[in-house]
Amino acid sequence: KKEDGESTAPTPRPKVLRCKCHHHCPEDSVNNICSTDGYCFTMIEEDDSGLPVVTSGCLGLEGSDFQCRDTPIPHQRRSIECCTERNECNKDLHPTLPPLKNRDFVDGPIHHR
């Protein structure tokens, strides 16, 4: 996982990286495998009904440094992990949703059963 403190500009990989993709497969992917000059990622986030949804795929080098940094977004529970160490490395990434803060109960929508 990339650490929050990293700020160096990403250097281009000498070769293409293949990643598993799920719910996030571009048109040029084949058999749920995409290719990139950047990173593989796996992300977990809550959908509109509060259920966790896992997506995975490829991030291009441009902007991926920021996207992989996993900065918290208010009122959105989401976590992303990125990797480059081998092809399909994101199969082994298992990000978890950040814990609910107390204010999320107050500020968030009220779901009636």
Epitope: P14, K15, P26, D28, S35, D37, C58, E62, N87
Partner: antibody
């Protein structure tokens, strides 16, 4: 200087097995994929598949999947293309080629002739 | 699979004249990263192919500046601005955007 040196020409009979090689030098062997490309006599180029020597990850052209096996030994910077049972239609020139995002260097080619 | 179609199949051009080879792909070659992985190779008899142009318009090291590439999306062109005797060869376009990677059928360039 980047060099890809392939093994010599082969003459085989149908049904025989074969493994041809491609040795890379002058660069970091694990920093690039190695591809294999077929050129049948008087014909064009066909991509067969590729291997990432750093993790042995392979991708095949569906046309060649199950027909050939691509492997690599990073300790000796060598990639391989092998057949378990050759057919007359495998007669062709086979090239290895270094691939990052495009092929930039090619081996000299290995001629494989399969005839009874 | 992406079909790469070159035109013409063969071409005869006088020394010093311009040669133009076209390549059309059956789908866009713009990759999801924004790059277009369309390349041109030259193959002389009895030799392996050589890279001339990568990613549409970038000349590979050591390639003379009379070779240039252009195009976008599905339509691409290789131009030799002033044909030399040593340019007699078969030229192939190739895409590495979509697996399986594919080549054009080749264009045979001769001297008129």
């Amino acid at each position: 200087e980047v060099q890809l040196v392939q093994s010599g020409a082969e003459v085989k009979k149908p049904g025989e097995s074969l493994k041809i090689s491609c040795k890379g030098s002058g660069y970091s062997f694990t920093s690039y994929w190695m591809q294999w490309v077929r050129q049948m006599p008087g014909k064009g180029l066909e991509w067969m598949g590729e291997i990432d020597p750093s993790d042995q990850y392979t991708l095949y052209n569906q046309k060649f999947k199950g027909q050939v096996t691509i492997s690599a030994d990073k300790s000796i910077s060598t990639a391989y293309l092998q057949w378990s049972s050759l057919k007359a239609s495998d007669t062709a020139m086979y090239y290895c080629a270094r691939f990052g995002y495009y092929v930039d260097y090619w081996g000299q080619g290995t001629t494989v002739t399969v005839s009874s | 699979d992406i079909v790469m179609t070159q035109s013409p199949d063969s071409l005869a051009v006088s020394l010093g004249e311009r040669a133009t080879i076209n390549c059309r792909s059956s789908q866009s070659l713009v990759h999801s990263t924004g790059n277009t992985y369309l390349h041109w190779y030259q193959q002389k008899p009895g030799q392996p192919p050589k890279l001339l142009i990568y990613k549409v318009s970038n000349r590979f090291s050591g390639v003379p500046d009379r070779f240039s590439g252009s195009g976008s999306g599905t339509d691409f062109t290789l131009t030799i601005s002033s044909l030399q005797a040593e340019d007699v060869a078969v030229y192939y376009c190739s895409q590495s955007t979509h697996v399986p990677f594919t080549f054009g059928q080749g264009t045979k360039l001769e001297i008129k």
